[in-house]
């Protein structure tokens, strides 16, 4: 039941975060910058991984997509590649966990089948997880680090003059939004593993007990009796249980001195 | 790269009109203001008329009633029609366009070239 529990969760944390990292990526919130000494009106510009737009405080709003896929920054192009990296493992993630939950039956599916299908979604959204904070925290740092103020602060362009204005730009919400998703994503497929451990047959649970039948070579011993044919050995020294039963694994390959009377 | 082109300077008589127009160009993104300054012969830089992309204008207050600036957003080209232009309304117009682009760039503004408007008789 725990097991169940534990896989339905992971289940359902991995489906909110990567729904956080898909909102994440389209969000245009990424990096904000608030100009407070305008000439005119109070406008706020924001800009995501595709487009970037300003807003005033009339209402007006108005977004245009990156022109280029050339001229972007390479640390641009590694954020929406991370991003997108996670979202294709997170689904492919979801997919392959809904056919391993343990509350849905399947065919025949065994329960060693939804075990390795249950690792492998919690390996994907672990994976998951960790590009979409990869991918958010290099964007923050391209923020911090305002790596474009390298520019002159004025120049001459082509037909007039140019001149670079000195702002700050602030993480977005979507970056939160990210750090939590991806966070989300990485716990529920922490989850989804723990919860192959419980699905996954022990080792105990499936070695054959054989029970044999009192022959020529059964001893009478106090505390239950043990059968044996006579072959394998218990290196092991495990306890004989009593009723006669024991595991392939407590055969013996020599005769022991009880054996024989 | 951006391009500024304006357009429709001349010479023109006391009490006449202009229409001056900005036409931009290239990789633009985030438009937050356009606008027009001049510099007359010996003087500083000013402040003609500025409009954001949402219609919100800002005019220097010697100006207000004889200029009006407006926007082509489609076309991202800034105009201003001149009326009753006065001998002091001479100088260079230089068209302005303040672009923000994000993280691709940062905050610039840009000033055209400059149109001569010469108001004599």
């Known amino acids: 039941m725990a097991v169940t529990a534990c896989q339905g969760l992971g289940f359902v944390v991995s489906l909110i975060g990567i729904a956080g990292i898909i909102a994440a990526t389209c969000m245009d919130q990424w990096s904000t910058q608030d100009l407070y000494n305008n000439p005119v009106t109070a406008v706020f510009n924001y800009q995501g991984l595709w487009r970037s737009c300003v807003r005033e405080s009339s209402g007006f709003t108005e977004c245009r997509g990156y022109f280029t896929l050339l001229g972007l920054p390479a640390m641009l192009q590694a954020v929406r590649a991370l991003m997108i990296v996670g979202i294709v493992l997170g689904a492919i993630g979801l997919l392959v966990s809904i056919f391993a939950l343990k509350c849905i039956r399947i065919g025949s599916m065994e329960d060693s089948a939804k075990a390795n299908m249950t690792l492998t979604s919690g390996i994907m959204f672990i994976v998951s997880g960790l590009c979409a904070i990869a991918g958010v925290s290099v964007f923050a740092n391209m923020l911090v680090t305002n790596f474009w103020m390298s520019t002159a602060n004025m120049y001459t362009g082509m037909g007039g003059m140019v001149q670079t204005v000195q702002t700050r730009y602030t993480f977005g919400a979507a970056l939160f939004v990210g750090w939590v998703a991806g966070g989300l994503t990485l716990i529920g497929g922490v989850m989804m593993c723990i919860a192959c451990r419980g699905l996954a047959p022990e080792e105990t649970n499936y070695k054959a007990v054989s029970y044999h039948a009192s022959g020529h070579s059964v001893a009478y011993k106090p505390g239950g009796f043990k059968a044996s044919t006579g072959f394998g050995s218990n290196t092991k020294n495990k306890k004989i249980y009593d009723g006669g039963a024991r595991t392939e694994d407590e055969v013996q390959s020599y005769p022991s001195k009880h054996d024989y009377v | 790269q951006v391009q500024l082109v304006e357009s429709g300077g001349g010479l023109v008589q006391p009490g006449g009109s202009l229409r001056l127009s900005c036409a931009a160009s290239?990789?633009?993104?985030?438009?937050?203001?356009m606008g027009w300054y001049r510099q007359a012969p010996g003087k500083e830089r000013e402040l003609v008329a500025l409009?954001?992309?949402?219609?919100?204008?800002n005019y220097a207050e010697s100006l207000k009633g004889r200029f009006t600036i407006s926007g082509d957003n489609a076309k991202d080209t800034v105009y201003l029609q001149m009326n009753s232009l006065q001998p002091e309304d001479t100088a260079v117009y230089y068209c302005?366009?303040?672009?923000?682009?994000?993280?691709?760039?940062?905050?610039?503004?840009?000033w055209g070239q400059g149109t001569q408007v010469t108001v004599s008789s």
């Open positions: 290239g990789n633009i993104l985030s438009i937050n203001y």
């Open positions: 302005y366009f303040r672009i923000n682009f994000g993280i691709l760039g940062g905050l610039r503004d840009y």
């Open positions: 409009i954001t992309r949402g219609g919100t204008t």
